[in-house]
């Protein structure tokens, strides 16, 4: 899976969309999880309604919401009041049994609010690396990760 970058402004809402084959994933609940480290587990943040037929109902966990258009095949995650600590690598997942298939890998970047003149030093952006393959740039707030970018800040 290539990684798609979604950029949002601190303090505002960010919508992440994850398209999928609606027939292939028919009947399956979805989830949004945060990757803990480059090879670590993906920690569940929020999942769609327990009854798949009600997946269109928005479910919240804190400031994160999820809703699923099961006919159109689009999972939408909303991160409300985006904060610097929300930056990082996430996954949209399709659940079956206790397993989860990755629908999309997402890198969330948090940009400084241009109207906020406070120190933006704690805002995080990806560093340099050569661990990711070529990927095309997508529209507006989202793009695929460029070659040479890494989704985790240096640990040293």
């Amino acid at each position: 899976h290539n990684t798609t970058v979604f950029q949002g402004v601190a303090g505002q809402s960010l919508q992440v969309s994850c398209p999928y084959d609606s027939m292939k994933h028919w009947g399956r609940r979805k989830a949004w999880c945060r990757q803990l480290g480059e090879k670590g587990p993906c920690q569940r943040v929020v999942s769609t309604h327990n009854l798949w037929l009600l997946s269109f109902l928005r479910r919240w966990n804190g400031s994160t919401a999820i809703t699923d258009d099961t006919l159109g095949g689009t999972l939408t995650i909303t991160l409300r009041n985006l904060q610097p600590h929300d930056a990082g690598l996430y996954q949209c997942q399709s659940l079956h049994g206790s397993e989860a298939d990755t629908l999309r890998k997402v890198l969330v970047e948090v940009l400084a609010d241009p109207l906020d003149h406070r120190d933006a030093g704690d805002l995080w952006f990806p560093g340099e690396s050569e661990s990711f393959e070529d990927a095309h740039v997508e529209h507006s707030i989202s793009r695929s990760l460029l070659e040479g970018e890494i989704p985790f800040p240096p640990t040293s």
Epitope: D21, M23, W26, R29, H96, G97
Partner: antibody, heavy 123, light 107 residues
Framework: EVQLVQSGAEVKKPGESLKISCKGS????????IAWVRQMPGKGLEWMGI????????RYSPSFAGQVTISADKSISTAYLQWSSLKASDTAMYFC????????????????WGQGTLVTVSS | DIQMTQSPSSVSASVGDRVTITCRAS??????LAWYQQKPGKAPKLLIY???SLQWGVPSRFSGSGSGTDFTLTISSLQPEDFATYFC?????????FGQGTKLEIK
């Protein structure tokens, strides 16, 4: 009426190749996953792997990975199971089965099965 | 892999009897379990899915229960056509695995 029709019985020699088929009808072939299950003579059922014909996404049991190849041709609603070099131990009945996800619990179960293809490998 | 263990491996019973077959998973599988019936020379047939949901067209004398690691299939009043082999199967994770089977024979 939903049907999975498998190809006929095969008698082969060790080292030969083989490809058996499973043709689905009465439903949209790109809406369901298709699994292959082995049953050796007088034994139980063994899940070999599964394929989604829409994009050929395939999962194998570790026990069968590298031993067989599962493929599909969505244009003719057919899934395949093939061997490049058969062994006597491959002698078994092979079933294909449609995997249906039940939205009650978001997991999948085998609701329709083919009649089975008996493969005999003997020198 | 998750191991599925059925007991007994065979059982003799008479028409009208109540029969219970058990299936134990080597780890918790929530309610992701199915039961199949297989007759000699035939393909398996789905009876129960999600541990307790009756597949369409299956007689109501068949019922399933359990969650986690322990599951049961019950036939409330055996009919002549019920003499067959029964398999449980976990739908929790790949690879899907089946129990070794329970052969139900006429006493």
């Amino acid at each position: 009426e939903v049907q999975l029709v498998q190809s006929g019985a095969e008698v082969k020699k060790p080292g030969e190749s083989l490809k058996i088929s499973c043709k689905g009808s009465g439903y949209s072939h790109t809406s369901y996953w298709i699994a292959w299950v082995r049953q050796m003579p007088g034994k139980g059922l063994e899940w070999m792997g599964i394929i989604y014909p829409g994009d050929s996404d395939t999962r194998y049991s570790p026990s069968f990975a590298g031993q067989v190849t599962i493929s599909a041709d969505k244009s003719i609603s057919t899934a395949y199971l093939q061997w490049s070099s058969l062994k006597a131990s491959d002698t078994a009945m092979y079933f294909c089965a449609r995997s249906r996800t039940f939205y009650y619990d978001s997991s999948d179960y085998f609701d329709y099965w083919g009649q089975g293809t008996l493969v005999t490998v003997s020198s | 892999d998750i191991q599925m263990t059925q007991s007994p491996s065979s059982v003799s019973a008479s028409v009208g009897d109540r029969v219970t077959i058990t299936c134990r998973a080597s780890q918790g599988i929530s309610s992701w379990l199915a039961w199949y019936q297989q007759k000699p020379g035939k393909a398996p047939k789905l009876l129960i899915y999600a541990a307790s949901s009756l597949q369409w067209g299956v007689p109501s004398r068949f019922s399933g229960s359990g969650s986690g690691t322990d599951f049961t299939l019950t036939i409330s009043s055996l009919q002549p056509e019920d003499f067959a082999t029964y398999f449980c199967q976990q739908a929790d994770s790949y690879p899907r695995t089946f129990g070794q089977g329970t052969k139900l024979e006429i006493k």
